[in-house]
Interface confidence: low
Amino acid sequence: SSPCPQAWGPPGVQYGQPGRSVKLCCPGVTAGDPVSWFRDGEPKLLQGPDSGLGHELVLAQADSTDEGTYICQTLDGALGGTVTLQLGYPPARPVVSCQAADYENFSCTWSPSQISGLPTRYLTSYRKKTVLGADSQRRSPSTGPWPCPQDPLGAARCVVHGAEFWSQYRINVTEVNPLGASTRLLDVSLQSILRPDPPQGLRVESVPGYPRRLRASWTYPASWPCQPHFLLKFRLQYRPAQHPAWSTVEPAGLEEVITDAVAGLPHAVRVSARDFLDAGTWSTWSPEAWGTPSTGTIPKEIPAWGQLHTQPEVEPQVDSPAPPRPSLQPHPRLLDHRDSV
């Protein structure tokens, strides 16, 4: 068996730090066997079998010119193997941030705080923080740690599924390279990192006979749970074409009638979402949708769609130890602003 411990990384590669003494190990011999060392591509003997260093090559104060492939051979000329020296630095604590697009799952991303120049991997785990007793924090099996599964495509991201909205979590991201490991711990709560995805399916339609009205409608983002315990509130902005300033309203539901549109001009509309009890932050804005008020006279009767509709209440779920949150579906306000005459 080889006398050389295999560091994590590609086979046949050994590692060192610039400015430090580096020992290279001849992999194909018995420990202590005297070997000759050559730099690949050059016949010059770097270290002979009489060095007293056995199967190792010592490079004092290695620098970038020492990087490359080395060849060792035994006394009888048998090839002992090839070793590639790669210089770099031990890991530094990675930069970690976490975000949630819904209240049941969150993801964490990371990046190196320093470039090590070496093959690097990341170990990701998390645990739920619980306090048992008055003055001590102890671990129980239900608190982890558990692995935070990483994206299969190699993106620097892991996802925690089935998180509890009211719990605190400690994320552990450890950067590992052949020269060591370094850990970043990050405490997160879903409430503080919640940022929904923007609403989807934004449509802007004219209201026949109302030259200053536009009707906007949208849906919850697909990433928000289908039967939500927690609702979203919305913020809608609109402006006529070529006007720099946005007007902002906070609709009560999934549609809004704008009553002060500029007749005859196309309008841009966009919408943003946030947890309805103000956890986390507002989403980014949805892509803009455009609409132009209709031309024509006001009809004598309010069309059927203009009547107020209510949605049935959603029963709060009580299978969670979390305090219940109000879960009424707000009434959509269709005709909430008086038309300017």
């Epitope: 086979p11 046949g12 992999p27 194909g28 050559f38 690949d40 591509g41 050059e42 016949p43 010059k44 003997l45 492939t69 060849i71 000329g77 048998a78 090839l79 193997g81 090839t82 590639t84």
Partner: antibody
């Protein structure tokens, strides 16, 4: 650019010796190993051995050890390979190749040695 | 001596196709395996060193993989000039030895 120019074709009788030369240019001759290889007609490649031009340290394939001698003349940047006790199965194209310690990066054009009675 | 066995002996493919050539060693040689291309009447040319390391001036369509005893040379999309004989060579122990070659011919 790196160039390896070999001596011309040879016809030898069984039992004789042949000495093939390889003149190097375009690089520092004493920095690289010189390998010798051969390829019999329609066959694969066979490594004969190598020599370190700076110290003339050689490694020979055991198959040829008793019949091959590799030398260098640093003053003319020329490497030589002599094979003795030739037999018909030594008929082949013989190549010199400048290499890393174990690789063959630049090749001569080849020298055909025919052994025939 | 370490014996290298290449397969197949002959591979018939068309330009644009992907070629996969195999080389198996009689004992583990780590990554000390190299690939050469030889065209009729020419000396061999080094394509890949140490199983997977590319060589300057060699087109990116040539790649290598493997470690231990099983190695592969892949040509992602064959060009007309790629039809030749390919040899693997080991540098794990003396004597340095070659496979018997794979002839890549136009179908």
């Amino acid at each position: 650019q790196v160039q390896l120019v070999q001596s011309g074709a040879e016809v030898k009788k069984p039992g004789a010796s042949v000495k093939v030369s390889c003149k190097a240019s375009g690089y520092t001759f004493t920095n690289y190993w010189m390998h010798w290889l051969r390829q019999r007609p329609g066959q694969g490649l066979e490594w004969i051995g190598n020599i370190g031009p700076s110290d003339s340290k050689t490694h020979y394939n055991q198959k040829f050890k008793d019949r091959v001698t590799m030398t260098v003349d640093k003053s003319t940047s020329t490497a030589y390979m002599e094979l003795s006790s030739l037999r018909s199965e030594d008929t082949a194209v013989y190549y010199c190749a400048r290499g890393d310690y174990v690789l063959f990066t630049y090749w001569g054009q080849g020298t055909l040695v025919t052994v025939s009675s | 001596d370490i014996v290298l066995t290449q397969s197949p002996a002959t591979l018939s493919l068309s330009p644009g196709e992907r070629a996969t050539l195999s080389c198996r060693a009689s004992q583990s040689i780590s990554n000390n395996l190299h690939w050469y291309q030889q065209k009729p009447g020419q000396a061999p040319r080094l394509l890949i060193k140490y199983a997977s390391q590319s060589i300057s001036g060699i087109p990116a369509r040539f790649s290598g993989s493997g470690s231990g005893t099983d190695f592969t040379l892949t040509i992602s999309s064959l060009e007309p000039e790629d039809f030749a004989v390919y040899f693997c060579q080991q540098s794990y122990s003396w004597p340095l030895t070659f496979g018997q070659g794979t002839k890549l011919e136009i179908k």
